[in-house]
């Protein structure tokens, strides 16, 4: 092992961590969990204790960016360097960034949770065997109901585990048709479709009608994405494989490096390459996510790299499903910081963790044969920032509510949108919402159906806010908006007529600006916006950190609340006060506990 | 010992080619960023390129940039720069530099090893 | 880019005495600053890294200070060998740049 001259350390030994963004390669838990795994590497062996925070003052700052992201060190692209970190120390010192060009996995491909099966929602293992032959993406082989699906070990024919995989033949996410599957064909606009289209959205989102008229019904659903099969290069990067294809006159189900003398996998993305030459490379193994940071974690904690090519600290990746650390890594560590206290714990395991098994429905026999009951639980969730609005017209009136412990606003973890509307707090999350008025004792009421009150809008909402001389609301879902006055609404109207770009994908607040004025918030950006002109001045877009310094950069909504500004990400708020012309974070909280004042047990 | 060693300058045609290369020893090569910094005469210090320790990133100055390229060997412990389309104002030495960063333990800046140069001048 | 100034752009002392060159960021580097000195006809050669990291060999007269956007390099009491042209250098965001020198001679 080696460490820099005057072994460069932390003088503390509670080291906190703060998430800063994430990959859209992995779910948000996969990444947190590799991150915590990584660092619990290390303290198994060492004094530390590393905990996760949010805020920007954490000692250990994790980041993905590509290319040049705000430092002297720019990433390369795809492969060559993954990621890099700084030794410990005041402000970036310390910090953690992961180039986002990589394909960020568990080592082992892409990571496709399942659903339904009989392997309680575990990750597809890719490759898999089934009949004998390797599949190194979901595949419908074997069904006749077009479902794909995966084993969820390296051999279905041995192991007889399978789960199916985001299909929308299984469920569609948001929309307005509760998550059910898409009906192929449907008809939308006099023409006849048999698979997910964009047709009719300007977000490039695939959507489909839940039953055979979408001109009839207008109920519709997003169908959900396939990381296992969507191309990197050739000539259709981003689009999915299509299986089975024809090459050469021969049929293929799954990807092949036929026709390649590197050995690649690649895959044609229309059903014959032959004719249509539309084609693109499959998902390959991707980094570990895991692996990359415990060795980054290693930088950040002071061990520079280690001349032992069995040890983590070794600057070249390898992929190992073994104990990562090697005994000159426990060796350099403990040089700067010492052993753990007695007594020894057990070494961290360092397998997954099993995603939480889907919702009851009935089971679905293997893959040969066809199931009994097409699955019908809705999807564990819509995307963070997933489209919510309709190809072209506001969805129908949402269903009653089932009763169930998410009805007390106090176990609602994260919040669709926030506002204050009239002297009220409402707070809105999966077709419901709830009124808060602030007092002693003073709980969350509801919740309500956001279709009785508001029948036009979707389940899903990015934010809201109240104008307050004309008293319109103004509800924003994905790349739409409708305006509500009193009863009558206005819309869904595209972002366009707004005057944002096509580069805004949804809204995710608003805060007053001056009479007449708002400012409207996407993501790191944020513009002036005219309330009677319904117009934003292109001009006056902003970075949302040189207005608001202190917040953070992924907040998910933003509102304003008894003249203060606040800033959510996660379940938590930063809490903004401006005093002579200087905004400053003056507090970060719970929205749970500390705004609803909910109890903390 | 660290080394580092230049060599192909030389006198050139503007529009011409040169390849320089730097000869590394003393050091695990393939573990750093090596750079490629030149001076014009009686001037100040220019970065002009780097090259990451795969080879796969490499960055170059605006002023050289489509003109020149970086490359390495790390079998050979040998860092290059094709030069092309040479121009007057390229006149300068040029020296290979190896960084104290790894390509992924930053946060090191600094170029702790030099070479001792080597002369390129671009004239008619 | 960010720019790097450096200040006098000529200074002259006599040995033994005290020498403090400037070196200031045109926006916050944090710490990622490098001092190099520079003979007639030889090659940079590192001072000082990350603002204040004496580097391998260098004798303990030199010190490096500063953080943000100002930096100091101070030689606490100046020997015949260390008269030759200094130069900061920046790495705190991409890409790097070097300040044009400041040139140290005998009074």
């Known amino acids: 092992f080696q460490t820099f001259e005057g072994d460069l350390k932390w003088h503390h030994h509670n080291i906190t961590y703060w998430i800063q963004n994430y990959s859209e390669d992995l779910p948000r838990a996969v990444i947190d969990d590799a991150f915590a795994r990584a660092f619990a590497l290390w303290s198994a062996v060492t004094p530390l204790t590393f905990t996760r925070v949010y805020s920007r003052d954490a000692d250990i700052v994790i980041q993905f960016g590509v290319a040049e992201h705000g430092d002297g060190y720019p990433f390369d692209g795809k492969d060559g360097l993954l990621a890099h970190a700084f030794p410990p120390g005041p402000g970036i010192q310390g910090d953690a960034h992961f180039d986002d060009d990589e394909l960020w996995s568990l080592g082992k491909g892409v990571v496709v949770p399942t659903r339904f099966g009989n392997a309680d929602g575990a990750a597809c293992h890719f490759p898999f065997i089934f009949e004998g032959r390797s599949y190194s993406a979901c595949t419908t082989d074997g069904r006749s109901d077009g479902l794909p699906w995966c084993s969820t070990t390296a051999n279905y024919d041995t192991d007889d585990r399978f789960g199916f995989c985001p299909s929308e033949r299984l469920y569609t996410q948001d929309g307005n048709a509760d998550g059910k599957p898409c009906q192929f064909p449907f008809i939308f606009q006099g023409q006849s479709y048999s698979a997910c289209t964009t047709d009719g959205r300007s977000d490039g989102y695939r959507w489909c009608a839940t039953t055979a008229n979408y001109d009839r019904d207008k109920l519709f659903g997003f169908c959900p994405t396939r990381a296992d099969s969507t191309v990197m290069g050739g000539n259709s990067a981003g689009e999915l494989c299509v299986f089975p294809f024809t090459f050469l006159g021969k049929e293929y189900s799954t990807c092949t490096s036929e026709g390649r003398g590197d050995g690649r996998l690649w895959c044609a993305t229309t059903s014959n390459f032959d004719s249509d030459k539309k084609w693109g490379f499959c998902p390959d193994q991707g980094y570990s996510l895991f692996l990359v940071a415990a060795h980054e974690f290693g930088h950040a904690l002071g061990l520079d790299h280690s001349s032992v090519p069995e040890a983590l600290m070794y600057p070249m990746y390898r992929f190992t499903e073994g104990p990562p650390l090697h005994k000159d890594d426990v060796n350099g560590i403990r040089h700067l910081y010492g052993p753990r206290p007695e007594p020894e714990p057990r070494p961290p395991t360092t397998t997954t963790p099993q995603p939480t098994a889907p919702p009851t429905v009935c089971p679905t026999g293997p893959p040969t044969v066809h199931p009994s009951e097409r699955p019908t639980a809705g999807p564990t969730g819509p995307p963070s920032a997933g489209p919510t609005g309709p190809p072209t017209a506001g969805p129908s009136t949402a269903t009653t509510v089932p009763l169930s412990p998410v009805d007390d606003a106090c176990n609602v973890n994260i919040f669709d949108a926030i506002a204050e509307i009239g002297n009220q707090l409402y707070l809105f999350k999966d077709g419901k919402y709830w009124r808060f008025s602030e007092g002693r004792g003073s709980r969350p009421q509801g919740p309500f159906l956001i279709a009785d009150k508001w029948p036009a809008l979707p389940r899903k909402l990015d934010s809201v806010f109240e104008e307050r001389l004309s008293k319109k609301l103004f509800f924003f879902s994905g790349r739409q908006v409708w305006v509500y006055t009193g009863a009558s609404v206005l819309g869904p109207r595209r972002l366009d007529k707004l005057g944002l770009g096509a580069d805004v994908a949804q809204v995710t607040g608003a805060l007053r600006s001056g009479r007449g004025k708002m400012l409207l918030f996407s993501g790191r950006r944020l513009w002036r916006f005219d309330v009677k002109a319904q117009m934003v001045d292109p001009r006056s877009a902003s970075e949302v950190d040189r207005m608001f310094p202190g917040v953070p950069l992924d907040t998910h909504d933003v509102f304003q609340y008894r003249e203060k500004a606040y800033f959510c990400q996660d379940r938590f708020y930063w809490r903004v006060s401006s005093r002579s012309e200087l905004n400053q974070v003056d507090q970060v909280g719970y929205v749970t506990y500390d705004i609803l004042q909910c109890p903390e047990d | 010992e660290v080394q580092l060693l230049e060599s192909g300058g030389g006198l050139v045609q503007p529009g011409g080619s040169l390849r320089l290369s730097c000869a590394a020893s003393?050091?695990?090569?393939?573990?750093?960023n090596m750079w490629w910094v030149r001076q014009a005469p009686g001037k100040g210090l220019e970065w002009v390129s780097?090259?990451?320790?795969?080879?796969?990133?490499?960055f170059y100055a605006d002023s050289v940039k489509g003109r020149f390229t970086i490359s390495r060997d790390n079998s050979k412990n040998t860092l290059y720069l094709q030069m092309n389309s040479l121009r007057a104002e390229d006149t300068a030495v040029y020296y290979c530099a190896k960084d104290r960063a790894y390509g992924d333990y930053v946060g090191w800046n600094g170029f702790d090893y030099w070479g001792q140069g080597t002369l390129v001048t671009v004239s008619s | 880019d960010i720019q790097m100034t450096q200040s006098p752009a000529t200074l002259s002392l006599s040995p033994g005495e005290r020498a403090t060159l400037s070196c200031r960021a045109s926006q916050s580097i944090s710490s990622f600053l490098a001092w190099y000195q520079q003979k007639p006809g030889q090659a940079p050669r590192l001072l000082i890294y990350d603002a204040s990291y004496r580097a391998t060999g260098i004798p303990a007269r030199f010190s490096g200070s500063g953080s943000g956007t100002d930096f100091t390099l101070t030689i606490s009491s100046l020997e015949p060998e260390d008269y030759a042209v200094y130069y900061c250098?920046?790495?705190?965001?991409?890409?790097?740049?070097f300040g044009q020198g400041t040139r140290l001679e005998i009074k």
């Open positions: 250098q920046q790495r705190g965001n991409w890409p790097i740049t």
């Open positions: 003393g050091f695990t090569f393939s573990w750093y």
């Open positions: 780097v090259i990451y320790p795969s080879g796969g990133g490499t």
